[in-house]
């Protein structure tokens, strides 16, 4: 099969207003070359969440622990979440076209949910 | 165990072409991205060509665009480098390489020695 | 392109005592965390051979002495205690998502 696989194990997340949320995200290959982006929601409506090589998202960082040969990890965390994050996000592989890149495949979804921060 | 074995290597007057084959035994070869690299005493180790696992996908580095065409066939578990207009340049030992993320190299041929000259 | 550059040159290390062969990239390799750095063994007369991945993975059946550490454009592999089954040419090797993948010039290490 030649399309790579986007893997987002996590139907859904919760956490605490307050507190950081790991999306998870994993591919079986870098091949068709492309960068890989978080959105939040889906369609032309979707909010672009992060993108390592350009933008500045100061409330992301990317969290890698998979060190599986067959697993490339493109996983990230959100500090200080607020209600406001709560929604769907979205792994994105595009592959590298002319002028723009190609939205090449999707992973399923995680869906954030944020509880109120303990009293 | 895996295996990798090339074929098709040769001398070549400059402009003239060569086909490499590459055999692969001993894993799904149709799950893996394949590479060619290739080796001069000169210039060190260098990528040639990468195709995708399902073989819609090829890339190459600028010094062998337009020249180099790779293909496979997942059925015969083999992998092919078409090598056109050849140069003096290209005069190196051809080794095939597999990806199975399409990342590093996991394994490798032994080679196949090409040499291009008049 | 990414050009890497490995130092030393070559190497000569006493049989038990540690090898430190250093890559270092004109620009980063690292993608969400992952450093897409790896690195190879060549001996005369045959293929490179994989031992580590992603900057500090040991691939399977490479005995432990061998180890590989750094990010973004600075990286290391290291080989402790070195054995006389070393010798050999290292090689570091990028696969960041730019084209074209690139090589080191390599490392030769010898027994002193």
């Known amino acids: 099969e030649d399309e790579l696989q986007v893997i987002q194990p996590e139907k859904s997340v919760s956490v605490a207003a307050g507190e950081s949320a790991t999306l998870r995200c994993a591919m079986t290959s870098l091949i068709p070359v492309g960068p890989i982006m978080w959105f939040r929601g889906a369609g032309a409506g979707r909010e672009l969440i992060y993108n390592q090589k350009e933008g500045h998202f100061p409330r992301v960082t990317t969290v890698s622990e998979l060190t599986k040969r067959n697993n490339l990890d493109f996983s990230i965390s959100i500090s200080n979440i607020t209600p406001a994050d709560a929604g769907t996000y979205y792994c994105v592989k595009f592959r590298k076209g002319s002028p723009d890149d190609v939205e090449f495949k999707s992973g399923a979804g995680t869906e954030l949910s944020v509880r109120a921060k303990p009293s | 165990e895996v295996q990798l074995v090339e074929s098709g290597g040769g001398l070549v007057k400059p402009g003239g072409s060569l086909r490499l084959s590459c055999a692969a035994s001993?894993?799904?070869?149709?799950?893996?991205?394949m590479s060619w690299v290739r080796q001069t005493p000169g210039k060190g180790l260098e990528w040639v060509a990468t195709?995708?696992?399902?073989?819609?996908?090829?890339y190459y580095p600028d010094s062998v665009k337009g020249r180099f065409t790779l293909s496979r066939d997942n059925a015969k578990n083999s992998l092919y480098l078409q090598m056109n207009s050849l140069r003096a340049e290209d005069t190196a030992v051809y080794y095939c390489?597999?990806?199975?993320?399409?990342?590093?190299?996991?394994?490798w041929g032994q080679g196949t020695t090409v040499t291009v000259s008049s | 392109d990414i050009v890497l550059t490995q130092s030393p040159a070559s190497l000569a290390v006493s049989l038990g005592e540690r090898a430190t062969i250093s890559c270092r990239a004109s620009?980063?390799?690292?993608?969400?965390?992952?450093?897409?750095m790896h690195w190879y063994q060549q001996k005369p007369g045959q293929p490179p051979k994989l031992l580590i991945y992603?900057?500090?993975n040991l691939e399977s059946g490479v005995p432990d002495r061998f180890s590989g550490s750094g990010s973004r454009t600075d990286f290391t592999l290291t080989i402790n205690p070195l054995q006389a089954e070393d010798v050999a040419t290292y090689y570091c090797?990028?696969?960041?998502?730019?084209?074209?993948?690139?090589f080191g010039g390599g490392t030769k290490v010898e027994i002193k």
């Open positions: 390489a597999s990806q199975l993320t399409g990342s590093e190299f996991d394994y």
């Open positions: 001993g894993f799904t070869f149709s799950s893996y991205v």
């Open positions: 195709i995708s696992s399902g073989g819609t996908y090829t």
């Open positions: 620009e980063s390799v690292d993608l969400y965390g992952t450093s897409f």
């Open positions: 992603r900057a500090s």
């Open positions: 090797h990028q696969s960041s998502d730019e084209l074209p993948w690139t």
